[in-house]
């Protein structure tokens, strides 16, 4: 008789999860020679220890602390790019602008990007059938707590001018319930961060509205200003052109607003 297994509402652990995390870690240390001495087996052991044998609705930031001890990677604190609901463009940007970093350009972010994982209470098994959904099941699940933990630390490390890419096509350009709105905004350190600069990315080709005047952007400005951090906002009317100009800034067509 098969043992009863908790059925969650979300998709199960990504197939070949241990192998994927280990392979990504090795690849990352090869791409980033400053991390060449990282022992990826130890990284996986710490990652695994955060959720294996634990109830997947009872995960805490404390569970990830052993793994976070690796999170001292020296990303330049003034080259941080946050994003909300526009991950692909943010990543395309940092692939071109190599001296800027999203969370997923750091080792821990790179390891977990787009993956799902959870375990089961009191067994060493990984649950490949289902994992808790943030809304339908519980918020203290392994994936959500991981991203909350690393996002908080990433925001805390930021300094000088911090950039955030926001999706202008969404009804809430700034969403207080997003990771950016609920975690990162509140963990920027006013004594280190001078300005948060928002880049609002337009979706439609003929969209010439000033989305920096959107009520949700004004709400973001209010939250940031109350935290004694300056706020600025720019419309990126043509994201394709924006990327092209990052690649070739000397192009004569890149002088006008994009």
């Amino acid at each position: 008789v098969p043992r009863w297994r908790q059925q969650w509402s979300g998709p199960g652990t990504t197939k070949r999860f241990p192998e994927t995390v280990l392979a990504r870690c090795v690849k990352y240390t090869e791409i980033h020679p400053e991390m060449r001495h990282v022992d990826c087996q130890s990284v996986w052991d710490a990652f695994k220890g955060a959720f294996i044998s634990k109830h997947p609705c009872n995960i805490t930031e404390e569970d990830y602390q052993p793994l976070m001890k690796l999170g001292t990677q020296t990303v330049p604190c003034n080259k941080i790019l946050l994003w909300s609901r526009i991950k692909d463009l943010a990543h395309q940007f940092t692939q071109v602008q190599r001296d800027m970093f999203t969370l997923e350009d750091t080792l821990l972010g790179y390891l977990a990007d787009d993956l799902t994982w959870c375990g089961e209470f009191n067994t060493s098994k990984i649950n490949y059938q289902s994992c808790p959904d943030w809304r339908k099941d519980c918020s203290n699940n392994p994936v959500s707590v991981f991203w909350k933990t690393v996002s908080r630390r990433f925001a805390e490390a930021a300094c000088d001018v911090v950039h955030v890419m926001l999706n202008g096509s969404r009804s809430k350009i700034f969403d207080k319930n997003s990771t950016f709105g609920s975690v990162e905004v509140h963990n920027l350190q006013p004594e280190k961060v001078q300005t948060l600069e928002a880049w609002v990315i337009h979706g439609g080709r003929e969209d010439s509205r000033d989305l920096c005047q959107d009520p949700t952007i004004k709400e973001l400005e209010s939250i940031i200003s109350k935290r004694n951090i300056q706020f600025s906002c720019k419309n990126i009317y043509r994201p394709d052109k924006f990327l092209q100009c990052v690649k070739n800034p000397e192009d004569s067509s890149c002088t006008s607003e994009i």
């Epitope: 020679p33 060449r36 710490a46 690796l70 001292t72």
Partner: antibody
């Protein structure tokens, strides 16, 4: 085969300066991280500084930060250590070392002795 | 600055097995590779073990390395007179953004 030859050691007064050089051959110098490691008389090995390949990033031990500068000249296959504000506790044999792909010191020079004394 | 902790000495008779421990923390050994070096007086140090347990070509298989948690060890089996030397463990340390060496262990063949 890989060869690392240090030079520039000698006797210097406290507060003085010295520049060590390391001539490298037998491998593609510009591809590898390079380091300086020292051993004070009767003491153990102590890492001093490292410099990356590519656009150089430098790393220093707390004991020398702000006083020593590591640099490299890939065109000359040479590694340098500029030592300023020298102290008696900097007296040591200084080794130049090549780093492998996993951070290990694969090849070492024979060392050059630096003596800081009045 | 705090380094890695090694016993000051270890000894054994010819043919015996000797183990040297190296203890650190999560900021060094815990998440980073451990390296072992052999140093004979008046010569350049020599890499014995890298990536916790890998031997460079030319290093006899009498030398083996292992790592568990925040500690590592070097084992020398079939001890020989030419193994008399100082042995150092080393690892990168995140909190220092640099390498740390152990204090060194002098191995004597009785």
């Amino acid at each position: 085969q890989v060869q690392l030859v240090e030079s520039g050691g000698g006797l210097v007064k406290p507060g003085g300066s010295l520049r060590l050089s390391c001539a490298a051959s037998g491998f593609t110098f510009s591809d590898d991280y390079m380091s300086w490691i020292r051993q004070a008389p009767g003491k153990g090995l102590e890492w001093v500084a490292s410099v990356s390949n590519g656009r150089p990033t430098t790393y220093y031990a707390d004991s020398v930060r702000g006083r020593f500068t590591i640099s490299r000249d890939n065109a000359k296959n040479s590694l340098y250590l500029q030592m300023n504000s020298l102290r008696a506790e900097d007296t040591a044999v200084y080794y130049c070392a090549r780093e492998g792909w996993s951070g290990e010191f694969t090849d070492w020079g024979q060392g050059t002795l630096v003596t800081v004394s009045s | 600055q705090a380094g890695l902790t090694q016993p000051p000495s270890a000894s054994g008779t010819s043919g015996q097995r000797v183990t040297i421990s190296c203890s650190g923390s999560s900021s060094n050994i815990g998440f980073h590779f451990v390296y072992w070096y052999q140093h004979l007086p008046g010569t350049a140090p020599k890499l014995l073990i890298y990536k916790n347990n890998q031997r460079p070509s030319g290093v006899p298989d009498r030398f083996s390395g292992s790592k568990s948690g925040n500690s590592a060890s070097l084992a020398i089996s079939g001890l020989r007179s030419e193994d008399e030397a100082d042995y150092y463990c080393a690892a990168w340390d995140d909190s220092l953004s640099g390498y740390v060496f152990g204090s060194g262990t002098k191995v004597t063949v009785l």
